[in-house]
């Protein structure tokens, strides 16, 4: 999100007052304020539903609650992607979809949510205790994943209240660092504001050279910077082995949907019109986890150019390879 603030032109500070520090003191709060406002912890919600008509058929819905630009979605089963899970689908917001059995139909529902229907028969079909995970790669938040499965006593047709997501992972270590900086910045901003109350404010007046005051553009993760690392897609994995995750499931009453937001209970938003987004510049881009390093030229471990963690529609399950095996 880019924030624009209209700020009147500033007169040079009077000698003996703020000096050179005056400019910095006035600009810094705007920058920090913008960062504080735009900063927010993203959430991923997962809903798993067993179809009433086909008891061995599942519908998985996942969504991303964040302000960033989704670059890729990966759906898997049997655990988190890269931790023993098997990729079911990979969805890219511009390039399309790659899906793997038993996925029957993966699709984007809105700009920030996807759904996946799984086949109800066959050796690879899911079972009631299957754990499904959805991983969203986005900029600037990084990679976020949540998992869910049907409660042990789930009756088709009923819906379970949202429960905390069992897994919330930011694969990019930098995320924590950024959060720390933002937190520090917000605290520092408050400190500056408090100090500012006790000192005379500098005189502000409109610019004499133009009828309109100049625009001071506060910095925030910009669309330009997002575009540089834009690698959209989604993947869904699932497996019918016993769930190894310590998932939280509601035990009250029968439930048909297991809804697992990453934090507080968030209901999925209704369908939203897709915003028209530019196609990322051509170049090598990596899988979901590596999507943000698309231009780095380094290949994620165990990945191949065409297998990609689903930057390539071809190898959703080849999430362990670069992008070739899409």
């Amino acid at each position: 999100m880019r924030t624009e603030a209209q700020v009147p032109a500033l007169q040079p500070p009077e000698p003996g007052l703020e000096g050179a520090m005056g400019h910095r003191t006035l600009v810094l709060p705007w920058v920090l304020l913008t960062l504080c406002v735009t900063a927010g912890t993203p959430e991923v919600w997962v809903q798993v539903r067993m179809e009433a008509t086909e008891l061995s058929s599942f519908t998985i819905r996942c969504g991303f609650l964040g302000s960033g630009s989704i670059s890729l979605v990966t759906v898997s089963w049997g655990g988190p992607n890269g931790a023993g899970g098997t990729t079911l689908a990979v969805l890219h917001p511009e390039r399309g979809i790659r899906q793997w059995a038993p996925a029957r139909q993966a699709r984007w529902e809105t700009q920030s949510s996807i759904s996946l229907i799984l086949e109800g028969s066959g050796a690879s079909s899911p079972c009631a205790n299957t754990t499904f995970c959805c991983k969203f790669a986005s900029f600037p938040e990084g990679s976020w994943e949540a998992c869910g499965s049907l409660p042990p006593s789930s009756d088709p047709g009923l819906s379970a209240p949202p429960t905390p997501a069992p897994i919330l992972r930011a694969d990019l270590a930098g995320i924590l660092g950024v959060s720390g900086v933002l937190l520090f910045g917000c605290v520092y901003l408050l400190h500056l504001l408090r100090r500012h109350k006790h000192r005379p404010a500098p005189r502000l007046q409109p610019s004499r050279t133009s009828p309109q005051a100049p625009r001071a553009r506060a910095w925030a993760p910009s669309q330009a910077s997002q575009a540089a690392l834009h690698v959209p897609y989604a993947t869904i994995n699932t497996s019918c082995r016993p769930a190894t995750l310590d998932t939280a499931h509601p035990h009250g009453g029968p439930s048909w949907w297991a809804s697992l937001p990453t934090h507080a209970a968030h209901r999925p938003q209704g369908p939203a019109a897709w915003a028209s987004t530019p196609i990322p510049a051509r170049g090598s881009f990596v899988s979901v986890e590596n999507g943000l390093y698309a231009q780095a030229g380094e290949r994620p471990p165990h990945t191949g150019p065409g297998l990609t963690l689903f930057p390539d529609p071809r190898g959703p399950r080849a999430m362990e390879g670069p992008l070739g095996v899409r």
Partner: antibody
Framework: EVQLQQSGPELVKPGSSVKISCKAS????????MDWVKQSHGQSLEYIGA????????SYTQKFKDKATLTVDKSSSTAYMELRSLTSEDSAVYYC???????????WGTGTTVTVSS | DIVMTQSQKLMSTSVGDRVSITCKAS??????VDWYQQKPRQSPKALIF???SRHTGVPDRFTGSGSGTDFTLTITNVQSEDLATYFC?????????FGGGTRVEIK
């Protein structure tokens, strides 16, 4: 040079099965998905499905789910497609195609003509 | 299934001319459309991917454009070797679907 060399033409009887091959060379076989496409009577193309040589994962369109079986042999860098319960509708040219990391078929096989006739 | 319609089945052109082949999707497919060229008795070959990116080695007289539902492959300064059938493909949703093809003949 990247190449996908397919097996020769097949003349088979209705109700039987046929297994066609696609041998990859010039690149690391397990790095790219292999897809299969059908072209009937020189007309348009139909997407059949894909296999991930690295994991063996497969994907079929509903239409071909009960018709085709996709497999790979990593040791020989070869992908296979078996077609069963053949009818005259299955007479066509079948292509394997490599799915690139840029999300398109960047290399196509030489094609295998399958003719189903009694 | 998403239907990809190539309304012109045959287009006749002369060497040096410009020809535009269109492909219409039955629903929004974003930029997930490719163009392939198939010469007589040959396998298809990639021309354009993701609506407008040119495949390696493809002459710059081939240009792709469009997004959403309407896509165009334009050949400027047509050459005799461009005699072929051109197919569009969408991979936005399963099953992937091809257009019916447009055959370009040289007068």
């Amino acid at each position: 040079e990247v190449q996908l060399q397919q097996s020769g033409p097949e003349l088979v009887k209705p109700g039987s099965s046929v297994k066609i091959s696609c041998k990859a060379s010039g690149y690391t076989f397990t790095d790219y998905n292999m897809d299969w496409v059908k072209q009937s009577h020189g007309q348009s193309l139909e997407y059949i499905g894909a296999v991930n040589p690295n994991t063996g994962d497969i994907s079929y369109t509903q239409k071909f789910k009960d018709k085709a079986t996709l497999t790979v042999d990593k040791s020989s860098s070869t992908a296979y497609m078996e077609l069963r319960s053949l009818t005259s509708e299955d007479s066509a040219v079948y292509y394997c195609a490599r799915w690139s990391e840029s999300w398109y078929f960047d290399v196509w096989g030489t094609g295998t003509t399958v003719t189903v006739s009694s | 299934d998403i239907v990809m319609t190539q309304s012109q089945k045959l287009m006749s052109t002369s060497v040096g001319d410009r020809v535009s082949i269109t492909c219409k999707a039955s629903q929004n497919v974003r930029a997930a459309v490719d163009w392939y060229q198939q010469k007589p008795r040959q396998s298809p070959k990639a021309l354009i991917f993701l609506a407008s990116s040119r495949h390696t080695g493809v002459p710059d007289r081939f240009t792709g454009s469009g997004s959403g539902t309407d896509f165009t492959l334009t050949i400027t300064n047509v050459q005799s070797e461009d005699l072929a059938t051109y197919f569009c493909l969408q991979h936005w949703n399963y099953p992937y679907t091809f257009g019916g093809g447009t055959r370009v003949e040289i007068k």
